[in-house]
Amino acid sequence: KAMHVAQPAVVLASSRGIASFVCEYASPGKATEVRVTVLRQADSQVTEVCAATYMMGNELTFLDDSICTGTSSGNQVNLTIQGLRAMDTGLYICKVELMYPPPYYLGIGNGTQIYVIDPEPCPDSD
C-alpha cells in the first residue's frame, strides 16, 4: 500500500454505544494539512461515516451533526464514534490523506472490527 496506517484489529463498543480507537500513520514528510475519514465496510459496500480535515497542531473538528469526535497528537488520531447500535457492528476503516503541502499521500488502514451489543432492557421491578 502507499502510506502506512495502523489501527487496532478489534474494539468492543461500550454499553452506551461508544467506541474509541487510535489511527496512526507514518508520514513521509512534514504535512501541515491532514484529512482523516472513517469508512464502514459491510459486505462489499463502503460508506463514509465521518471525515475531518485538520491543520497539524490544531484540534480535529468534525461537522456538528457528526457521530464522530476526535483529537490529534503528532501522527496519531484518537477517534470516537458514538450512537452505535448492534446493527452498526462492522469493519471501520481509517483513511488518512496528507493534503498539503504537495505531494499528496494516501493511506488506508486494515480496518477495526467494532462489535456493538445492544444493552438488555432493565427488567420491571415489582
Epitope: 502506512h4 493534503m99 505531494p103 499528496y104 494516501l106
Partner: antibody, heavy 115, light 107 residues
Amino acid sequence: EVQLVESGGGLVQPGGSLRLSCAASGFTFSDNWMNWVRQAPGKGLEWLAQIRNKPYNYETYYSASVKGRFTISRDDSKNSVYLQMNSLKTEDTGVYYCTAQFAYWGQGTLVTVSS
Amino acid sequence: DIQMTQSPSSLSASVGDRVTITCRTSENIYGGLNWYQRKPGKSPKLLIYGATNLASGVSSRFSGSGSGTDYTLTISSLQPEDVATYYCQNVLRSPFTFGSGTKLEIK
C-alpha cells in the same frame, strides 16, 4: 521554484545498460517518495519504479515490465534519484520522467534502444 | 494488480462544451486516483489529486468526482488550450498504474 532535471538518456544497443539521473531542487527532497515514469512512442504513461524515503526505510517498488532489470536508488545528500537500466530491450525506448510522488515532474530524457 | 479502464480513448468536442472522461478501476481504490494532462512535447501535469482535489495553479474548469471504482474528470467549458491527452492513475498502491489515456481534440 520546484525543478527536476533528468539526464543520462541516449542511444544504446539492445542488451546494453544506461544510468539515468534526476537532480531536484526547490522542495524538501528527503521528505518525498520519488518515481520514474516513461512514455514509449505512441503509447501512454507507464509507471516504472518508486523509492520511498528514510521513514519508510528506502523501500523500492517496480512494475512487472522492469523488475529484475532496472534499479532505482537515491542520494538525499545530493537531492538526486537514479535509475540503473540493464538488459535493455527495444521496447524500453521512450521518454523517461522522474517525479516527486506525481506532483512535480521533470522535462524528461529520451532513451533509444536500437541496433 | 489494479486495472484502470479509461474511456473514451479519444474525444472531439466544441469550444464551450462540457466534457467528461471516466476511469473505472478493477477494485475499490478509496479515492486514491489522480488525473493528469499531457500536451505534446510537454511533461505530464497533475490536475486532480485524491479523486476530487484541484491541484495548485489548475483552472477551476477542471473538476474530479467519484469514489469506489468509478471516477470522472470534467471540463466545465472546453477551451482551445485544453487540447491534450488525459490520464487517470491509481495512487493507492503499487503498481501505480495509469489509464490508457483520452486524446481530446477541438471540433
